[in-house]
Amino acid sequence: MSVTACQGLGFVVSLIGFAGIIAATCMDQWSTQDLYNNPVTAVFNYQGLWRSCVRESSGFTECRGYFTLLGLPAMLQAVRALMIVGIVLGVIGILVSIFALKCIRIGSMDDSAKAKMTLTSGILFIISGICAIIGVSVFANMLVTNFWMSTANMYSGMGGMGGMVQTVQTRYTFGAALFVGWVAGGLTLIGGVMMCIACRGLTPDDSNFKAVSYHASGQNVAYRPGGFKASTGFGSNTRNKKIYDGGARTEDDEQSHPTKYDYV
């Protein structure tokens, strides 16, 4: 796959994932009423990160926002924070990646700068995706815990003990937003990885360490100047390379396993 295609596809995948993260964050169906024991409920309860809703048999739907910050469970606050961080990082990632796209020419921006920007946006997308996945997973874990607690309480006659206010007979299970969030987080993560892979291909030819070592007459040690590598921004390296077979070789051609020359 060409660098441009990999970068472009990574951008599109991340964009779709990012849109999904926003959608999941805004959705009201993070948790939905468990209908296992009462499949014919006339009042269907579901809850999001920002409000809880009811859909009645009459067709009427009403939602109430969580108008308090202090009264909400810490876990819910944490999930909100993770999703918002994911969205913010995603926004920054998209802005950076637009300028990094190889198919878009902006002034005299060279490939080296585009490579750095592509890597940056890739990392931002990866973190954004991870934030979303962790956020959704934390919420799912909270639901599972509350589900079993309320189940135990049902049989012991104590009443519901959920993270959010629950009535005795209402248990909550996974809502559509959780699945949207997991998929969206995964796509954003994959898109970010693709951007990082594209970054390697974007690195200019004079700075991807294909340094040529020439056979030096009178001695069989060739030195690569440290200053060259330092100029690429990746730090200097004055490691010696021994040349036994004469002629020019690139670093990419070197074998990591022993060769017939290693034991001369």
Epitope: V43, Q47, S58, F60, R64
Partner: antibody
Framework: EVQLLESGGGLVQPGGSLRLSCAAS????????MSWVRQAPGKGLEWVAT????????YYADSVKGRFTISRDNSKNTLYLQMNSLRAEDTAVYYC???????????WGQGTLVTVSS | DIVMTQSPDSLAVSLGERVTMNCKSS????????????LSWYQQKPGQPPKLLFY???TRESGVPDRFSGSGSGTDFTLTISSVQAEDVAVYYC?????????FGQGTKLEIK
């Protein structure tokens, strides 16, 4: 003005069948969940069946499940209750009702009397 | 099924008197989604179909005189008439609107002394 007009009631023998109709007017029938409620002579109210807006979901009281079928024809603005295998205890005035906020029944028809007797 | 129990079965009061009738459900009718109680009150006068008075336990239906008030939460609900009028003679029913099957109380009959 909202109006619900039931028809189709009458005298029927045990084991017989009857189809009640409810003609709705004065509102967008297709946008409302509808129900049937009955009242035996001198007794209290008993919910019979409900059909959700689209008609895809129907709910029944245990006492009529498997014998009664609620349906609707939105093009004709009409609600139906098909009653089969009728019993003496099904004798009642049958009301057609409209559900609104809170699943409450805000409009009721005048009712149609169904008498099951041999 | 949710069982609705009304008390008293009947009561006779003088005109202008304050009257209270109760309704108790076997399960909570409070929805966690909107913190509303799914209970409605109906008035049925002799020879007439029932008329909706309150939904969500305390939300008055339009056209209902303000001498009527509904209250309560969870499993215990009350219908109050602050000053009984002659036209209030009727049977009053409470209904579970929370889950199927919808169930009605047996009714409370209000009469004038």
């Amino acid at each position: 003005e909202v109006q619900l007009l039931e028809s189709g009631g009458g005298l029927v023998q045990p084991g017989g069948s009857l189809r009640l109709s409810c003609a709705a007017s004065g509102f967008t029938f297709s946008s409302y969940t509808m129900s049937w409620v009955r009242q035996a002579p001198g007794k209290g109210l008993e919910w019979v069946a409900t059909i959700i807006i689209g008609g895809s979901y129907t709910y029944y009281a245990d006492s009529v499940k498997g014998r009664f079928t609620i349906s609707r024809d939105n093009s004709k603005n009409t609600l139906y209750l098909q009653m089969n295998s009728l019993r003496a205890e099904d004798t009642a005035v049958y009301y057609c009702t409209r559900l609104v906020k809170g699943n409450a029944m805000d409009y009721w028809g005048q009712g149609t009397l169904v008498t099951v007797s041999s | 099924d949710i069982v609705m129990t009304q008390s008293p079965d009947s009561l006779a009061v003088s005109l202008g008197e304050r009257v209270t009738m109760n309704c108790k459900s076997s399960q909570s009718l409070l929805s966690s989604g909107n913190q509303k109680n799914y209970l409605s009150w109906y008035q049925q006068k002799p020879g007439q179909p029932p008329k909706l008075l309150f939904y969500w336990a305390s939300t008055r239906e339009s056209g209902v005189p303000d001498r009527f008030s509904g209250s309560g939460s969870g499993t215990d609900f009350t219908l109050t008439i602050s000053s009984v009028q002659a036209e209030d003679v009727a049977v009053y029913y409470c209904q579970n609107d929370y889950s199927y099957p919808f169930t009605f109380g047996q009714g409370t009959k209000l009469e004038i002394k």
